[in-house]
């Protein structure tokens, strides 16, 4: 995963909503103990902002060393800065930990831009505002990096919450969450509420701000409104899902649904943008431009480079369309849709114009590695990573930014046929997709 800005075909037919309600998360469902309800100690345990990632406080070693760790559902290594770096206020000092164990093995992780490398070991890890447990987990001690740490981001490491298949150097390195579930009674599930501010935050505001919640082992009802709708995890590597239809202001993009998932679609908290395959991106931008044609914006804006500024408080949200992604449902031929607002896909940027202006970047971008549902999407929703049942749930976030006219939405069910055909089957070549 790259944090920041990462980091033979058939059509799925989106139909009208069905009259009946198909099964989804209800209080009647059998559940593991402690999976639902209130997790007061974990609410508001994230800080940060979409452009630089959301982080949770963790402690590593004995005595415990406190570090801020980026929450990343698009990778599977727990890796922390372990040497001085100009962008790090603190780092993991293995020599000070009596419980550190060296695995005598190196790890090297390249990205499209940048990389990190380090030394593998294990140590005791806990999450102060998480479950009251301590686990021995694999840790990559980052000794060298390039374009990985972000100046001013306030995090010193990364918590990869995806599956072992994409762990580095290979899938034998157990990810943190697997270790947590194996060693404790924490249910195999976590949920994320990422709260975009809707306005730019300066450094002191970020440090003081609440960025959201990571609920480990459960679902907190206070963090969402309406119902949770679930989509299957297609394959346990990234959190891969299947998009079956895309609409801009209710207008179907009318593309072969395989295009939406070429070569995969993933949910990734470590990516800022909604990233779309080239063809889909071009079609989406064309449609968004048409919908917002009362104003014209420079080409560089649509490339995510130039910032458009409006007088503070006068951003014309109404001229920008809503974007709906239809996801495969849990029931055959059933889908549901998640709808985001321009308040999610126009990202506020600080320090570029005067205080009398609000400036934004277009946070939808082109991808050569499939669709990435990054913070832009996740900030609209409470997202449940139900690993135990191999599914991801979406509900409208209680903290999403909206206006008096429109709100983010999770709606269903819809009849959609042949959804399985929307998935793309990646040719099996070793590590073909890991250079993201």
């Amino acid at each position: 995963t790259q944090h920041g800005i990462r980091l033979p075909l058939r059509s799925g037919l989106g139909g009208a909503p069905l009259g009946l309600r198909l099964p989804r998360e209800t209080d009647e469902e059998p559940e593991e103990p402690g999976r639902r309800g209130s997790f007061v100690e974990m609410v508001d345990n994230l800080r940060g902002k979409s452009g630089q990632g959301y982080y949770v406080e963790m402690t590593v070693g004995s005595p415990p060393q406190t570090l801020n760790i980026l929450v990343d559902t698009g990778s599977s290594n727990f890796a922390v800065g372990a040497a001085p770096h100009p962008f790090l206020h603190r780092y993991y000092q293995r020599q000070l930990s009596s419980t550190y164990r060296d695995l005598r093995k190196g790890v090297y992780v390249p990205y499209t831009q940048g990389k990190w490398e380090g030394e593998l070991g294990t140590d005791l890890v806990s999450i102060p505002h998480g479950p009251n447990v301590t686990v021995r987990a694999n840790i990559a001690a980052i000794t060298e990096s390039d374009k990985f740490f972000i100046n001013g981001s306030n995090w010193e490491g990364i918590l990869g919450l995806a599956y072992a298949e994409i762990a580095r150097p290979d899938d034998s390195l157990e990810p943190f969450f697997d270790s947590l579930v194996k060693q404790t009674h924490v249910p195999n599930l976590f949920s994320l509420q990422l709260c975009g501010a809707g306005f730019p935050l300066n450094q002191s505001e970020v440090l003081a701000s609440v960025g959201g919640s990571m609920i480990i082992g459960g679902i907190d009802h206070s963090l969402y409104t309406g119902s949770l709708w679930y989509t299957p995890i297609r394959r346990e590597w990234y959190y891969e899902v299947i998009i079956v239809r895309v609409e801009i202001n209710g207008q179907d993009l009318k593309m072969d649904c395989k295009e939406y998932n070429y070569d995969k679609s993933i949910v990734d908290s470590g990516t800022t943008n909604l990233r779309l395959p080239k063809k889909v991106f071009e079609a989406a931008v064309k449609s968004i431009k048409a919908a917002s044609s009362t104003e014209k914006f420079p080409d560089g804006f649509w490339l995510g480079e130039q910032l458009v500024c409006w007088q503070a408080g006068t951003t014309p949200w109404n001229i920008f369309p809503v974007i709906s992604l239809y996801l495969m449902g849990e029931v055959t031929n059933q889908s549901f849709r998640i709808t985001i607002l321009p308040q999610q896909y126009l990202r506020p940027v600080e320090d570029v114009a005067t205080s009398q202006d609000d400036c934004y970047k277009f946070a939808i971008s082109q991808s050569s590695t499939g669709t990435v549902m990054g913070a832009v999407i996740m900030e609209g929703f409470y997202v449940v990573f139900d690993r135990a049942r191999k599914r991801i749930g979406f509900a409208v976030s209680a903290c999403h930014v909206h206006d008096e006219f429109r709100t983010a939405a999770v709606e269903g069910p819809f009849v959609t046929l042949d959804m399985e055909d929307c998935g793309y089957n990646i040719p099996q070549t070793d590590e073909s997709t890991l250079m993201t």
Epitope: E295, K296, F297, P298, G300, Q306, V352
Partner: antibody, heavy 120, light 108 residues
Framework: QLQLQESGPGLVKPSETLSLTCTVS??????????WGWIRQPPGKGLEWIGS???????YYNPSLRSRVTISVDTSKNQFSLKLSSVTAADTAVYYC????????????WGRGTLVTVSS | EIVLTQSPATLSLSPGERATLSCRAS??????LAWYQQKPGQAPRLLIY???NRATGIPARFSGSGSGTDFTLTISSLEPEDFAVYYC??????????FGGGTKVEIK
């Protein structure tokens, strides 16, 4: 080829409203490819952007002048206009109209400019 | 707010010499920078856009370079008609709004 020409009074009294019009010839203010802008330059000083307008009437203003500026467009006459209220001597300048082209990011064609003096 | 600082304020050179003008942004503007030439009594004229692209009809002796925060306008061999004031302008923030203070290129 496309030309822009500013017109309006060269002398305005303090506290009154400065009004200028830019007439576009050889091109159209209803083009979807351009914004149209006003820039001014006080004598012996640098350039200051005043504001820009699109064919739809959508406007953007310099925050420092926003409370006093109105820019409008009349596509039927192929003109766009500037009004600056409550003027003072500090508003004395050469006023230029310009086309915003090259990906609507730069002022690629300019009028010759008109000097407006604010004095009683 | 992004501030553009041009240096030197005045550059005294002879015809045929090479002129190097600098524009520094207070923060990165990527490649969204233009250069304008203004002769006495005339309107500015666009020379370079997107840091290094010559506008239509601009002679090859004018070239622009740089990205991020540091930009340079180079006139490889000054012609008599090149003595003028040169302004840079950024459009990372849109609409385009910010100009530098200008550099005057005068005859030595």
């Amino acid at each position: 080829q496309l030309q822009l020409q500013e017109s309006g009074p060269g002398l305005v009294k303090p506290s009154e409203t400065l009004s200028l019009t830019c007439t576009v010839s050889g091109g159209s203010t209803s083009s979807s490819s351009y914004y149209w802008g006003w820039i001014r330059q006080p004598p012996g000083k640098g350039l200051e952007w005043i504001g820009s307008i699109y064919r739809s009437g959508s406007t953007y203003y310099n925050p420092s002048l926003r409370s006093r500026v109105t820019i409008s467009v009349d596509t039927s006459k192929n003109q766009f206009s500037l009004k600056l209220s409550s003027v003072t001597a500090a508003d004395t300048a050469v006023y230029y109209c310009a086309r915003v082209g090259h990906g609507i990011s730069y002022f690629d064609l300019w009028g010759r400019g008109t000097l407006v003096t604010v004095s009683s | 707010e992004i501030v553009l600082t041009q240096s030197p304020a005045t550059l005294s050179l002879s015809p045929g010499e090479r002129a190097t003008l600098s524009c520094r942004a207070s923060q990165s503007v990527s490649s969204y920078l233009a250069w304008y030439q203004q002769k006495p009594g005339q309107a500015p004229r666009l020379l370079i856009y997107d840091a290094s692209n010559r506008a239509t009809g601009i002679p090859a002796r004018f070239s622009g370079s740089g990205s991020g925060t540091d930009f340079t306008l180079t006139i490889s061999s000054l012609e008599p008609e090149d003595f003028a004031v040169y302004y840079c302008q950024q459009s990372l923030t849109w609409p385009p709004r910010t100009f530098g203070g200008g550099t005057k290129v005068e005859i030595k």
